[in-house]
Amino acid sequence: KETAFVEVVLFESSPSGDYTTYTTGLTGRFSRAGATLSAEGEIVQMHPLGLCNNNDEEDLYEYGWVGVVKLEQPELDPKPCLTVLGKAKRAVQRGATAVIFDVSENPEAIDQLNQGSEDPLKRPVVYVKGADAIKLMNIVNKQKVARARIQHRPPRQPTEYFDM
């Protein structure tokens, strides 16, 4: 279970008309459910139940986004429509270049994601918890365009980190 280094870049327009980019660094773990490789894309928050919907209405999906899913306490969803792995699979099928799960309220999901799969996804499936998860969700909940850059080694040059 390798460390996933996640840079979240937030794009904000300043009064002068320039873009200010705020970069926040956080760490997660690559799960065995997916590949250990770099990925990047716009952050799209997905509700766990939103991944249940199977009516494939689109002819073509849009590719290259990073799905962020905050998992709920298992008690709140005793009979999930899909396993956590199934949800990751569904997101990747819909064009996600990576999936990040906030497992803070459902730590059991870590084991589910790390069960040796015969057919792991070809895209990274990362999980975050604790302070890193809080940091991520704070960004996701802002009305801002944000992009995640996931790397399997620390960023080469030191990045300025802004606490969101």
Epitope: G41, G50, W65
Partner: antibody
Framework: EVQLVESGGGLVQPGKSLKLSCSAS????????MHWIRQTPGKGLDWVAY???????VYADAVKGRFTISRDNAKNTLYLQLNSLQSEDTAIYYC??????????WGQGTLVTVSS | DIQVTQSPSSLLASLGERVTITCQTS??????LNWYQQKPGQAPMLLIY???SLQTGMPSRFSGQYSGRSFTLTITSLEPEDIANYFC?????????FGAGTKLELK
């Protein structure tokens, strides 16, 4: 079937305003980011603005402070408010679905002509 | 802002010929560049995304490559229906920017 239909274009005087609409159907509109792109007749493409699923927005330098992108998920509609219009804003305006970039689906465009 | 320089601006080619169009970016953008095809009177269509991935439904004679800040669109053997305008777009950081376009015509 995924469809995007732009409307609201027309002839407008310099300095005046216009509001473009893009009506979406055939997909879950609220789940997708949306772009506006424009094209001066017979010329190249210019990316104009983007709105994310959580209503975060970014704009091209040329329109910043004058144009406003917005969305109404209940009405499955994307908007572009054009203020302080200039002759250089004359173009066909397209809406397109996508996250980081305008993707697989574009509308057929609506023509905005700015002239006195 | 990231500048995108596309060349050539126009291109005359014969049917069956190999065609190459290039976009150069002013800074490193990883693989965050797309190619679009636009036929007269139509909206642009996504042809290649993330520099090398062919959009579903597009013919396999189209391909994309990149090295550093240089991106290439190749048509291995030109067909009549490929006569169109081609644009590249960088989507690494906003504001996103298109190349000026290449008008591909039959010789």
């Amino acid at each position: 079937e995924v469809q995007l239909v732009e409307s609201g274009g027309g002839l407008v005087q310099p300095g005046k305003s216009l509001k473009l609409s893009c009506s979406a159907s055939g997909f879950t509109f609220s789940s997708y980011g949306m772009h506006w792109i424009r094209q001066t007749p017979g010329k190249g493409l210019d990316w104009v603005a983007y709105i994310s699923t959580n209503s975060g927005t970014v704009y091209a330098d040329a329109v910043k402070g004058r144009f406003t992108i917005s969305r109404d998920n209940a009405k499955n509609t994307l908007y572009l408010q054009l203020n302080s219009l200039q002759s250089e804003d004359t173009a066909i305006y397209y809406c397109a679905r996508g996250y980081n970039y305008p993707g697989a689906y574009w509308g057929q465009g609506t023509l905005v002509t700015v002239s006195s | 802002d990231i500048q995108v320089t596309q060349s050539p601006s126009s291109l005359l080619a014969s049917l069956g010929e190999r065609v190459t169009i290039t976009c150069q970016t002013s800074q490193s953008i990883s693989n965050n560049l797309n190619w679009y095809q636009q036929k007269p009177g139509q909206a642009p269509m996504l042809l290649i995304y993330y520099a090398t991935s062919l959009q579903t439904g597009m013919p396999s004679r189209f391909s994309g490559q990149y090295s550093g800040r240089s991106f290439t669109l190749t048509i291995t053997s030109l067909e009549p229906e490929d006569i169109a305008n081609y644009f590249c777009l960088q989507h690494y950081n906003p504001p996103y920017t298109f190349g000026a376009g290449t008008k591909l015509e039959l010789k």
